[in-house]
Every structure is written in C-alpha cells, then in structure tokens.
C-alpha cells in the first residue's frame, strides 16, 4: 500500500476549478523532493503534466499550478477552466521519476446538467436580488398575479397581487408591472439566502386558461477564491460588493466552526491578534474596499469573508465574498524579531529587509496608527523627508545591494512605542511590521557627549567628543550631521583608536568631531554612532547651537564650507572607513508620503528586529533639553 | 450546530450490502466535508471514507481496507450523506459513526472533524 494519500475521486463539471491536496509521510527527504502530477496512459505510462520542479505541460499551461505545503506534509495541485477532455486517471507522487510513490486519483468532468426546456433558470449570489420575469396572455391581464415555491406536495404563496405575503418574504419580496406593459409581471426578491433556492411558478389567471412559468432559482454560495502567500509576507483581500451595499458598514470575518469572527470593519472593530498589522480602505462609492494584512503568521491561514451590513457584523441575506488563505512556510522573506526595545532617551536601530533583486526602489517608514480604519502615515523614505515632529532624532540609510536598509529613531520617548512597518515601492510581499517597546530608562546612557551645553561661536573652533564604553571598542564609531534629508557621515577622530588593544581604559574612549571655523550653518542636530560593517548600533544626538562672538575675541577667516568639519589631531589616526559616507539626498515626497496612499498599497507583509544593541540612551539629554523638548513634545 | 442522525444499520452475512444514511440537519451550510469512521470494540476509531465539496466539485477519499467495496455518495438538497457497503467481511464489523466538518486539513484524523452522529451497528456474521 502507498504511503501517499489523497482523494481518490473527485467529480466536478465543465468549466469549473479542482483543488486536489496529495499527503505524504513527515521525513525531512519527503519534504524536499520532486512532486509530480502526471496521467495515466493506456500503456501504462505515466505522462507529467506538472511537477515542483517548475514543469509544466502544455495542456495545463496558464490553468494549473503545483504548491507544496512541506510544515503540513501536503501538495496542492489546482487545475481550472476544466473540460470533459481532462477526464482520466491520475497520480499525484514524490519522487525524481513518476516510478516513486505515488496514489492514484480519477478525475470525472461532467456536462453542466440541462433542465427542461420550459424552465427559466436564474443564477444569484448569496445576499442579492433577482428579478423574475413572468409573462401572461393579454387575457389574463385582470386576474390575480402570484408567484409560488413549489415543495414536495404543493406550491407554497410567495406573494401575489393582493398584497399577500408569506411571512419569510416580507420585506423581501415586490409583485410589480412596468409602465403600461400588461403582458408581463415581475417578482423581485432581494437578500438571498442559500433558503430562497428552488423552483418556483409564477401564475396569472386560474384554472386551465392560467398562464403559468417554471422557475429554477439558484442561490450560489460564492467560491472561495484560493490565496496562497508565504510566511511574513503579507496579503491585500479586494473586496466588490457592488453599489447597493455602499454605504453599508464593511467587515472581514474570518470563519470559525459555525462563525464568522469579524477581524475588522469600517465601525472601529479590530481582533487584537491584528493589532499593527491591518488596515482596512474603503476605495470608491461602489462598495469596494480592500484589507491588507501584513506580517503573516502560520495561524493566519484559514477560511476568511468579507461583506457589508449596517451592525459591521456578518448577517444573512447580505452579500459576501471568500477566500482561502494558505501560508507557505517555505518563505523567501527573512525571519527577523518582531519586537524591538528601546529605552527612553535611548535610541533603535532597525533593519528594514527588502527584495534584494529592487535595490533601487524607494524605501519607507510609517508608524501604523489604528484609529479609525486604520493607516500609516510616512515618517521617513529615500525620497519623503522626514517628518516635523522627528526632526533631529530620525533617519533611513539606505545600503543598495545588499537587501536591507535601516532607520535609526533617536532620543526616545514612551509615545514612540507602537507599531512601525518598513515597506517600498517594489516587490510588496516585503512589507515588514515591526513593534517597537519602549521602557524607562535605569542606567546611565552608552554614549554620552561632552560638552553638555553645545554652543559654539561663530568663526571659531568648536569640538565635541562622544564617549563610548569598552563593549563598543571593536565597532565603528561615526559622527553624522542630521538634515531632514539624512544624516551626512562626517570625518572624526576615535581617540580610542590609539590605545594599545589589548587594555580599554573606560574613561577615555571617545571620538570627538571639531567644526573649524564654526558657520552659521553648522547649527543643527549632530548624531555619534556606532556601527559594525553596514549593520548600525546606538546613536545619541546633540544639537550644537551657533552664537556671534562676544567684542575682544580673535578673528579667524573663513574657511572652505566643505572643510569646516576638520579631524582633532594626527590625519593617519582617523578611520578612514567612516570618512566622508553620504547617504543619498530625498529631496521630494515619494509616493507614499501621502497617508491615502499608504492605506492603498498593494500586497505584502512581514515582522521585523532590531540590528545593534537595542536599549541605548541620549547623552545629550541634559545640554540640549530646551531645543528636545520645543521639537518633541 | 449540525446534528447527524445515522441509520441503515444492522446484522448481515458476509459478501452481504447494506447501505448506512447520515442526514445532517441545523447550520448545515457551514459543513465543507462528511464521512464515516468505525470502530470496533477494544479498537481506536479509524477512517472509513469521507466526502468533501466545493461548489459542484466533489472529492472522495477512502481507506485501503474498503477500497473498491465501499461507496461514499451525497444528496446535496436532502443534506445526506450515503455509505454503499458491498461485499461485507467479518472484520468491518463496527460502530459507525458520521462525522461533519467546517474544515478539513487531513481527513483521515477523526479530530478535525467537528460533529459526530451517535453511531449505528454494523456486525457481520461468517
């Protein structure tokens, strides 16, 4: 007996779709091997019409496709569009040739069924209306009108021209005429339900003179549309449910034994499950809207809904679409932490993963806010500057090529704790969400800048040094001059660098920047970090205020703009690695800096961490406390 | 809730047919796949067959042990649930059970099911 298991028939008619899952035994070789799908010939050949290794024949090409689900130790193969043509036998198996284990399935497509021919067949979804037609001899005009279900024994009144009603239809159900027509009458029933399907007649006049009409009304749950999305990334629910229902409250429940637990609605709701992970946009006044879920877990896969009622809460009778989510945990996007944290004052560094093969897409950050439906306003991107309320404490360095870029969020306070994602404008699967804990601070910060009060006079010589601990010795240190368009690496001096490397003296690592002559332009925000390669550490910032010089001093001349920023002492003791690194200018908002536009993107998702020691604290709390505080609070 | 009644039960000879009945009534429309598992006394309950749908497309899986003798069939409008047993042998005799589910991720395993019929006998004498 195979040890392979799977349907062994399955019936559906023409035109219609197959989801065919195959299980096969929990060994690591299992998971990893070829999966094929071939047909049984008459000679005992067994021909591949579609495999995981990327084959696919002819015959299935633009309708079939193979998805292996190794954490389930299942395959799925999904044919649509299917004819009588593909009636047959068939195997679904592991292995490098179609001789390996296998199971075999029969597959039977049928001809869609005819009905008589007198009868009228009507074809709705769940929660719409149906207008039937129901023509009559001029003669007839005068009498009753009336439209009935037919049941085992007798045709029960579903209303008629009296005004009779039967009970499940009031409300429901409207007998009319258009204009001077007298030769047909209409019935329309609207909020159907799977209990409205069945045949009806429809009758005008008595006895053998009537006229009478068979009606075949069919109520169609709608089918689930099959999604399948790999783990972290993240998935856009496009929902249409039509001009009628526009100004209805909008839900997406997802379904649980009998029930539908609403996820979220336009109402306010929210599974805290979700929390920093959802948005819901309604788009037009058609009753389309769209949810996006980002950050896929393994538990997200299942059967979800979407519809719209006035309670934002499922509701029979109103229309619905559907959807099956699987999530593959065989996943191209890098499993990160989904928690980073910080301490007040202190400072993240947060690696943002993207599609490697889009290094020159834009990259963004948006703090997700879920008031309301829901959004993500940009705070940062590579070419959106930054935002007013994080000027000086904010920046995105973006390393082309390699695969991630990082934001740095400074000078920390307990209202940045929340939920931020990093996303593009490429490949949307990459969008990550990332939680961001912020604690009060208990030690004294890793980096500390002296001189506390940072003024420097105009024309003359002005230098700040960041002290760092021993634990930083091996890393990288840097200054950075802060615009709202990055943060411009400058050349320093890491007086560290001097000692013998086999004793750190803890009181006299640091790496001090000197402005010579100081400008007015060199007021602003500065920032000592450390970093290892491309992957950065804490930061502190310090804003150096820039005063005239007070009657009596001496006069320096003004120097190169360029070479204001000059190293403290020997020019061979500075780290050349650090000097002169410019992160690129973002000039003009991108297309995301709009927050419409960021509950509008398209697909994707993922959790995310911190690179570098999360925790860090701002050494110049105390020297630049006025200037903080009139930024940021 | 769904409530499955079996019926169809009874004392038969081997190489006899019998033909069990599961009708399914309540929120029957949340149901995606029904089947029949037995057990036997002393013995774990194991799969028999089972039925799952989507939209007109119908999908049968069953146990080696019963393949080729046994039938699984559905009466969409009647919510019922059909298992053909032909060519009976000593070794099916058992309980058997209808079950429900809402979702079915291997159904094989009795707990994805999730409501059960109260069981009918089934014995085959030699």
């Known amino acids: 007996k195979s040890p392979i298991f799977g349907p062994q028939e399955v019936s559906s008619i023409e035109g219609d779709s197959v989801s065919i899952t195959c299980y096969y035994p929990d060994t690591s070789v299992n998971r990893h091997t070829r999966k094929y799908w071939c047909r049984q010939g008459a000679s005992g050949m067994c021909t591949t019409l579609i495999s995981s290794n990327g084959y696919l024949s002819k015959e299935y090409s633009g309708r079939a496709n193979l998805i292996n689900f190794p954490e389930n130790n299942t395959f799925v193969i999904n044919i649509e569009q299917l004819t009588q043509d593909d009636t047959g036998s068939y195997k679904c198996g592991l292995g490098t040739s179609n001789r390996g284990l296998s199971f075999d399935v029969s597959l039977e497509v049928s001809q869609v069924p005819e009905l008589p021919s007198d009868t009228h067949v009507y074809t709705k979804d769940i929660g719409r209306n149906v207008t039937i037609e129901c023509p009559f001899k001029r003669e007839n005009a005068p009498s009753k009108k009336s439209l009935c279900k037919k049941t085992n024994q007798s045709c029960e009144l579903v209303i008629d021209s009296t005004e009779k009603v039967n009970p499940s239809y009031i409300g429901r159900a409207k007998l009319f005429m258009k204009g001077t027509d007298l030769t047909v009458f209409y019935v329309n029933i609207s909020h159907l339900t799977h209990n409205d399907a069945g045949l009806y007649i429809c009758q005008a006049g008595e006895g053998p003179s009537a006229d009478k009409k068979n009606v075949d009304l069919q109520v169609l749950a709608p089918e689930p549309e099959l999604l399948y999305k790999d783990l972290r990334s993240s998935v856009t629910f496009e929902c249409d449910l039509g001009r009628e229902v526009a100004n209805e409250a909008k839900y997406l429940c997802r379904m649980n034994k009998e029930t539908c637990d609403v996820i979220i609605n336009t109402l306010g709701k929210r599974d805290p499950d979700f929390e920093g992970r959802i948005l819901i946009t309604p788009k037009d006044d058609n009753g389309r809207f769209s949810v996006l879920i980002t950050g896929l877990r393994k538990e997200d896969a299942g059967h979800y809904q979407c519809g719209a009622h006035s309670s934002g809460l499922p509701q029979e009778g109103w229309p619905i679409q559907t959807w099956q989510l699987f999530v593959n945990e065989e996943s191209t996007i890098p499993n990160r932490r989904s928690v980073v944290k910080g301490v007040t004052g202190g400072s993240v560094a947060i690696a943002c993963p993207y599609n490697p093969k889009e290094s020159s897409s834009l990259k963004y950050w948006c703090r997700w806010e879920g008031d309301g439906n829901g959004h993500c306003p940009v705070l940062v991107g590579t070419q959106a500057q930054v935002q007013e309320e994080y000027e000086g404490r904010l920046a995105l360095f973006d390393q082309p090529g390699n695969g991630t870029y990082t934001v740095i969020l400074n000078q920390l306070t307990t209202e940045d704790a929340g939920f931020y994602w990093c996303l593009t404008n490429g490949d949307s699967r990459w969008r990550t969400t990332i939680e961001l804990q912020v604690a009060e601070a208990t030690r004294e910060p890793n980096l500390e800048v002296t001189p506390q009060n940072a003024t420097a006079v105009l024309g003359e010589t002005f230098t700040v040094s960041c002290h760092y601990p021993c634990k930083f010795y091996s890393q990288e240190k840097y200054w950075c001059k802060w615009s709202n368009k990055g943060c411009h690496i400058l050349p320093s001096h890491d007086e560290g660098a001097r000692q013998s490397s086999v004793s750190c003296d803890q009181s006299s690592q640091l790496v001090s920047m000197t402005l010579n002559p100081v400008s007015k332009e060199d007021e602003g925000w500065y920032w000592c970090g450390v970093k290892q390669g491309q992957t950065y550490g804490e930061t502190t910032a310090i804003y150096i205020a820039v005063e005239e010089r007070t009657r009596g001093s001496s006069h320096v001349n003004p120097t190169d703009a360029n070479a204001r920023a000059k190293v403290a002492l020997e020019e061979e003791v500075v780290d050349s690695s650090i000097s002169e690194k410019e992160n690129k200018a973002i000039p003009n908002p991108g297309p995301f800096a709009n927050e419409r536009e960021i509950q509008n993107v398209g697909d994707q998702a993922q959790e995310n961490r911190a690179s570098g020691d999360a925790g860090s604290a701002d050494g110049q709390s105390r020297s630049s406390s006025s200037k903080h505080h009139h930024h940021h609070h | 809730q769904v409530q499955l009644v079996e019926s169809g039960g009874g004392l038969v000879q081997a190489g006899d047919s019998l033909r069990l009945s599961c009708a399914a009534s309540?929120?029957?429309?949340?149901?995606?796949?029904m089947g029949w598992f037995r057990q036997a006394p002393g013995k774990e309950r194991e799969f028999v067959t089972t039925?799952?749908?989507?939209?007109?497309?119908?999908?049968?899986y069953y146990a080696d042990s019963v393949k080729g003798r046994f039938t699984i069939s559905r009466d969409n409008a009647k919510n019922t649930v059909y298992l053909q047993m032909n060519s009976l042998k000593p070794d099916d005799t058992a309980v058997y059970y209808c079950?429900?589910?809402?979702?079915?991720?291997?159904?094989?395993?009795?707990?994805?099911?999730?409501?059960w019929g109260q069981g009918t006998q089934v014995t085959v004498s030699s």
């Open positions: 309540g929120r029957t429309r949340t149901t995606y796949g």
């Open positions: 039925i799952t749908w989507s939209g007109s497309t119908n999908y049968k």
């Open positions: 079950a429900a589910s809402t979702v079915l991720t291997d159904p094989r395993v009795p707990t994805e099911y999730d409501y």
